[in-house]
Interface confidence: low
């Protein structure tokens, strides 16, 4: 008779719901501080009065909103991912920059370049980067379009990264591409400006290779005419990274115990 | 003081390892029978003497071996996926079939057709299909190659499904593509023969579109000469499905309680 | 699944996700998190009743595995299945920071 | 991770994956599964020690969350994290069947 043994392992004891709620709340108090690596809540003495800056709210909203193509957070998470990630964003270099000149005439592609010094300011070391997403605001689209994303590789070569099938839509929608590996590479290299290309998917026999989709930040009509930029909603890189000061704790703690 | 309450929720009691092992073993006894929807172990009275048939062992090995491109089983699983899935395989239609004639001359693609009557024999209803993988034995490859998989859609059109970057390799390697949705479509439709196309990835500006990779089942050299088939290792569909008799239990039990 | 859709609308006594909204100011006495003001943390609670016996009448317990002990554990436990992250805004000195905290919101539970 | 690489080579007393090989014939008395003859089922065992208190000395317990209560549960529990399927061959009458059983092999555990 294993009666006593069974009791040892039983999980179906009556548990007071209020006690559990209280314990959960207290556990969350510790969890949040722990994820931020804070021993106690930060002092609010120097916090400027008034509402949060617009740019901060925009960044917060970008992080909060799940967008097309972004996968739900994977579970399980590596140990380093337990800790909070600082979120920053780096906007695409404006299109009057000379880098765009030699890419103007293509009907099947648009180009997006980023200043690596801005990236390095946000993420000082490649190893700190936990996730990088390229976010594009896609405007209305009349027909289904299959697009591909490429990374600028060497002088005139492009490396395929991923693809997406875009359904027709009457309303604007944010698209997200995971470009963590690419941005990590950029942070490791010495280049000043790095870029992506969004192209129509070209099959080996098809000849209709026009990029139909409109991305905010590039004027519609000829794909080559990269003139007007629509404010903050031009393409950007959303970066999630471990802050440098927090990373030092993680260095040698490769295992959880 | 919540001392007693704490004890209620404590998980750090000393537990006898042997008892836990015994409980785990007994739980697995029930789990296996439950997953197979068997009330008791099946009778062995009619089992033929001698070793298992070659084809059964080959199928078992195909299932056991994790192959390139196949993701580890996702967790969480939907309720229906708790139950065991019967595994079958359907080989590609041999290449002397007339269906291949009109696709012979391409250097950028190979074609693989399947008999839907064989698929229906293995999986009588689309809803029973839990997973379908297209498995290809890729032979040695000298250079990196980016390939794309398409589904035959209508008379002469092909629908893009997925892509894969194949690294150079001196040894043969099985590739796996998840084609569950496509096979489910085929089972719902009336067609007799359905197919896939494996093509070199063609970018909008590149003109070098030759498929370099050799897939077992198609002779090397000219991609167009689809003559010799190398035994059981030609492309096949690996199907995992709920057996019809087991599915009836699942019909009305939409929720676990 | 034992998710918010099912559990919040039922009186399920066994393992299920339970509603818990945390207001940073009221529940934790914190004013330092500027956004959001609180969040639906939720939690998992409820037994995973599972009959274990050395006798051979397995048919009795077979139906229970899928519900209460799908992983054939020696002592199944009600734990989170699907989790979601939470972004927050707070200040370090005069500098506002946006940070993402992983696995903060429980969307569904399972007996494991 | 609390996986087979770490747990099988350590004397970890806390939550970890533990070795368990099941021989269908010896352990279950079954001759009806023709392939495999047995498998490494493994299991999760060990406490997820976690100090909960109403006092305000949080700094003491902060370091513990990642190890023992990453999900901020009221009562963390040692459960499977990564699972793998098991294919089997058995006969129904004269007909051999290959079936895949999901989530049969425990590869790693976590406090959840």
């Amino acid at each position: 008779d294993y009666k006593d043994d069974d009791d040892k392992l039983s999980t179906s004891k009556t548990i007071d719901m209020e006690l559990v709620k209280r314990k959960r709340i207290e556990a969350i108090r510790g969890q949040i501080l722990s994820k931020l690596r804070l021993a106690s809540p930060p002092s609010q003495g120097e916090v400027p009065p008034g509402p949060l800056p617009e740019a901060v709210l925009a960044l917060y909203n970008s992080t909060r909103d799940r967008v097309a193509g972004e996968s739900a957070e994977p579970e399980p998470e590596p140990e380093a991912d337990y800790y909070a990630k600082e979120v920053t964003r780096v906007l695409m270099v404006e299109t009057h920059n000379e880098i765009y000149d030699k890419f103007k005439q293509s009907t099947h592609s648009i180009y997006m370049f980023f200043n690596t010094s801005e990236l390095r300011e946000a993420v000082p070391e490649p190893v700190l980067l936990s996730r990088a997403e390229l976010r594009l605001l896609r405007l209305k689209l009349k027909v289904e379009q299959h697009v591909e994303l490429y990374q600028k590789y060497s002088n005139n070569s492009w490396r395929y990264l991923s693809n997406r099938l875009l359904a027709p839509s009457d309303s604007p929608e944010w698209l997200s591409f995971d470009v963590t590996g690419v941005v990590r590479q950029w942070l490791s290299r010495g280049g000043e400006i790095e870029g992506f290309r969004l192209s129509a998917h070209c099959s080996c026999d098809s000849r209709d290779n026009t990029l139909q989709v409109d991305i905010n930040g590039f004027t519609t009509g000829r794909r080559g005419d990269l003139a007007t930029i629509h404010g903050m909603n031009r393409p950007f890189l959303l970066l999630m990274a471990t802050p440098l000061e927090r990373a030092q704790h993680l260095q040698s703690s490769r295992h959880r115990r | 003081d919540y001392k007693d309450d704490d004890d209620k929720l404590s998980t750090s009691k000393t537990i006898d390892m042997e008892l836990v092992k015994r409980k785990r073993i007994e739980a697995i006894r029930g789990q296996i029978l439950s997953k197979l929807r068997l009330a008791s172990p099946p009778s062995q009275g009619e089992v033929p003497p001698g070793p298992l048939p070659e084809a059964v062992l080959a199928l078992y090995n195909s299932t056991r071996d994790r192959v390139a491109g196949e993701s580890a089983e996702p967790e969480p699983e939907p309720e229906a996926d708790y139950y065991a899935k019967e595994v079958t395989r359907v080989l590609m239609v041999e290449t002397h079939n007339e269906i291949y004639d009109k696709f012979k001359q391409s250097t950028h693609s190979i074609y693989m057709f399947f008999n839907t009557s064989e698929l229906r024999e293995a999986v009588p209803e689309p809803v029973l299909l839990s997973r379908a993988e297209l498995r290809l034995l890729r032979l040695k490859l000298k250079v990196e190659q980016h390939v794309e998989l398409y589904q035959k859609y209508s008379n002469n059109s092909w629908r893009y499904l997925s892509n894969r970057l194949l690294a150079p390799s001196d040894s043969p390697e099985w590739l796996s593509f998840d084609v569950t949705g496509v096979v489910r479509q085929w089972l719902s439709r009336g067609g007799e023969i359905e197919g896939f196309r494996l093509s070199a990835h063609c970018s909008c500006d590149s003109r070098d579109n030759t498929l370099q990779v050799d897939i077992n089942g198609f002779t090397t050299g000219r991609r167009g000469d689809l003559a010799t088939i190398h035994g059981m290792n030609r492309p096949f569909l690996l199907l995992m499905a709920t057996p019809l008799e087991r599915a009836q239990h699942l019909q009305s039990s939409r929720h676990r309680r | 699944a034992l998710d918010t859709n099912y559990c919040f609308s039922s009186t399920e006594k066994n393992c299920c996700v339970r509603q818990l909204y945390i207001d940073f100011r009221k529940d934790l006495g914190w004013k330092w998190i500027h956004e959001p003001k609180g969040y639906h943390a939720n939690f998992c609670l409820g037994p995973c009743p599972y009959i274990w016996s050395l006798d051979t009448q397995y048919s009795k317990v077979l139906a229970l595995y899928n519900q209460h002990n799908p992983g054939a554990s020696a002592a199944p436990c009600c734990v989170p299945q699907a989790l979601e992250p939470l972004p927050i805004v707070y200040y370090v000195g005069r500098k506002p920071k946006v940070e993402q905290l992983s696995n903060m919101i429980v969307r569904s539970c399972k007996c494991s | 991770a609390l996986d087979t690489n770490y747990c099988f080579s350590s004397t970890e007393k806390n939550c970890c994956v533990r070795q368990l090989y099941i021989d269908f014939r010896k352990d279950l008395g079954w001759k009806w599964i023709h392939e495999p003859k047995g498998y490494h089922a493994n299991f999760c065992l060990g406490p997820c020690p976690y100090i909960w208190s109403l006092d305000t000395q949080y700094s003491k317990v902060l370091a513990l969350y990642n190890q023992h209560n990453p999900g901020a549960s009221a009562a963390p529990c040692c459960v499977p994290q990564a699972l793998e399927p098991l294919p089997i061959v058995y006969y129904v009458g004269r007909k051999p069947k290959v079936e895949q059983l999901s989530n049969m092999i425990v590869r790693s555990c976590k406090c959840s």
Partner: antibody
């Protein structure tokens, strides 16, 4: 099996420095908290300090000025650097693996080395 | 600083005797208390942690109790191999890791 072997002890003159090492084997060293404890001849145990996996250290108040604890996870070795030694530092020095079955029990000495004798004498 | 005061500092007992050693902390340490046994020429060995939890492999004749400031180690029936020095230890945090001065258990 688990082994901790201290070395580097011996006779040293007052005011000089000494570095003790503790070589660990039989367990995943980089995942474990480690402690140094000493025992003067014929006396009781004195906790010197502890180092967590990440390199964070705690030391007894009396040890803070002169004693430094460090570790090299790649070499599976724990170190104790002792400066400005005095006669009262004469003791057997033990390294011990901290235990972590409950929260604060990094400071429960779960497994001890055999110790190395340090004699401070002119 | 926390102080751990052990008593008695030594005791004589016979095989089969019940032996009790006490330890008092200068301030509350909850149940963050451990007991060690040390034999001559050997390092200490952990017997009990969390005031009352027996370390695996330690005979059940050893038991611990107490919380807050007062703790007790009991050997229910002294065996020949139990003659040794016993130390209590506090460990509520990194600033309060302290050992008692020890209790020597000798043969009567």
């Amino acid at each position: 099996q688990v082994q901790l072997v201290e070395s580097g002890g011996g006779v040293v003159q007052p005011g000089r420095s000494l570095r003790l090492s503790c070589a660990a084997s039989g367990f995943h060293f980089s995942n474990e908290a480690m402690n140094w404890i000493r025992q003067p001849p014929g006396k009781g145990l004195e906790w010197i300090g502890y180092i967590y996996t990440s390199g964070t250290t705690y030391r007894s108040n009396w040890a803070r000025g002169r004693f430094t604890i460090s570790r090299d996870n790649s070499k599976n070795t724990l170190y104790l650097q002792m400066n400005s030694l005095r006669a009262e530092d004469t003791a057997v020095y033990y390294c011990a693996r901290g235990w972590h079955i409950f929260g604060h029990q990094y400071w429960v000495m779960h497994f001890w080395g055999q110790g190395t004798l340090v004699t401070v004498s002119s | 600083d926390i102080q751990m005061t052990q008593s008695p500092s030594s005791l004589s007992a016979s095989v089969g005797d019940r032996v009790t050693i006490t330890c008092q902390a200068s301030q509350s340490i909850s149940t963050y208390e451990a007991w060690y046994q040390q034999k001559p020429g050997q390092p200490p060995k952990l017997l009990i942690y969390a005031a009352s939890t027996l370390e695996s492999g330690v005979p059940s004749r050893f038991s611990g109790s107490g919380s807050g400031t007062d703790f007790t180690l009991t050997i229910s029936s002294l065996q020949p191999e139990d003659f040794a020095t016993y130390y209590c230890q506090s460990y509520s945090d990194g600033d309060s890791v302290k050992f008692g001065q020890g209790t020597k258990v000798e043969i009567k």
